[in-house]
């Protein structure tokens, strides 16, 4: 298991929410990506392929997510101060072999300007 800080901008703020970007290498064909808040699984997305190369995408812990060919974005809404924490992208690579797990993360700072419904 490889642990480290994300070497890219992991948090993108917009409209009182945050997009958490979890990247993976272009070569990865099948994987599970979990978003962890501290040690708790918040969201996950699994991409697999069958024997006819048909793609299956599953979420056991559903969040609004977006898949591209090298990243999974998870979206959290209605930000408040309780969202401030360490967030980790836990990537399990199934294909290509060998099976590998990587963990990258960063701290989500919440500032007043990023909250959805500020009191004036």
């Amino acid at each position: 298991e490889i642990n480290g800080s994300a070497n890219y901008e992991m948090f993108i703020f917009h409209n009182g929410g945050v997009q958490i970007l979890c990247k993976y290498p272009d070569i990865v064909q099948q994987f599970k990506m979990q978003l962890l808040k501290g040690g708790q699984i918040l969201c996950d997305l699994t991409k697999t392929k069958g024997s006819g190369n048909t793609v299956s995408i599953k979420s056991l812990k559903f969040c609004h997510s977006q898949l591209s060919n090298n990243s999974v974005s998870f979206f959290l809404y209605n930000l408040d101060h309780s969202h401030a924490n360490y967030y980790f992208c836990n990537l399990s690579i199934f294909d290509p072999p060998p099976f590998k797990v990587t963990l990258t993360g960063g701290y989500l700072h919440i500032y007043e300007s990023q909250l959805c419904c500020q009191l004036k």
Partner: antibody, heavy 117, light 111 residues
Framework: EVQLVESGGGLVQPGGSLRLSCAAS????????MDWVRQAPGKGLEWVSN????????EYSPFVKGRFTISRDNSKNTLYLQMNSLRAEDTAVYYC??????????WGQGTLVTVSS | DIVMTQSPDSLAVSAGERVTINCKSS??????????LTWYQQKPGQPPKLLIF???TRQTGVPDRFSGSGSGTDFTLTISSLQAEDVAVYYC?????????FGQGTKLEIK
């Protein structure tokens, strides 16, 4: 150790039906696509059908589409193949196989289906 | 559907000799950096066994006398030094698209 055990084969008349089962153990069944592959006596391998991890996607060979239905019960770790309108050319050993992400990495011993009057 | 054609249909080789089995697909099996081509071995009375995936990657536990090569439409399974226990039928298989198909098989015997 991965184990796949097929059952339900037998002799059936043309036009008849059979339901095959495959009991899986030794791995997390709900994490894998599963397939049926058949082999006519003295012949080569022929893919029949597959199903994704939760049963929401199923694909079929053109030779069996509309007659066969694949399904799974993840609570029972069991794969099924419902075969209707059976023909003589469906006579074969039917293998249950785990699709291990990029190949059929585990196979059962097979169950023989004979379609004859 | 992609058609997989193996050659030869059968061969008899002396123990210790090198064996080459060919497989040709009717269209390219290359996607990105992967060839979606697999080799299986089936001994009499047994289910098939996975030997090689992605054209050239040996499955864990498979002896290193087995190797796979090729790309696109032309692939080869090589046994560097034939052993008595290698008597079997060998199948190539693609999973490039649906339906996945197998070659007709190559029967390997000891001379």
């Amino acid at each position: 150790e991965v184990q796949l055990v097929e059952s339900g084969g037998g002799l059936v008349q043309p036009g008849g039906s059979l339901r095959l089962s495959c009991a899986a153990s030794g791995f997390t069944f709900s994490d894998y696509w599963m397939d049926w592959v058949r082999q006519a006596p003295g012949k080569g391998l022929e893919w029949v059908s597959n199903i994704d991890e939760d049963g929401s996607i199923a694909e079929y060979s053109p030779f069996v589409k509309g007659r066969f239905t694949i399904s799974r019960d993840n609570s029972k770790n069991t794969l099924y193949l419902q075969m209707n309108s059976l023909r003589a050319e469906d006579t074969a050993v039917y293998y249950c196989s785990r699709w291990g992400r990029f190949a059929f990495d585990s196979w059962g011993q097979g169950t023989l289906v004979t379609v004859s009057s | 559907d992609i058609v997989m054609t193996q050659s030869p249909d059968s061969l008899a080789v002396s123990a210790g000799e090198r064996v080459t089995i060919n497989c040709k697909s009717s269209q390219s099996l290359l996607s990105g950096s992967f060839n979606y081509l697999t080799w299986y071995q089936q001994k009499p009375g047994q289910p098939p066994k996975l030997l090689i995936f992605y054209a050239s990657t040996r499955q864990t536990g498979v002896p290193d006398r087995f190797s796979g090569s090729g790309s696109g439409t032309d692939f080869t399974l090589t046994i560097s030094s034939l052993q008595a226990e290698d008597v079997a039928v060998y199948y190539c298989h693609h999973h490039y698209n649906a339906p996945p198909t197998f070659g007709q098989g190559t029967k390997l015997e000891i001379k």
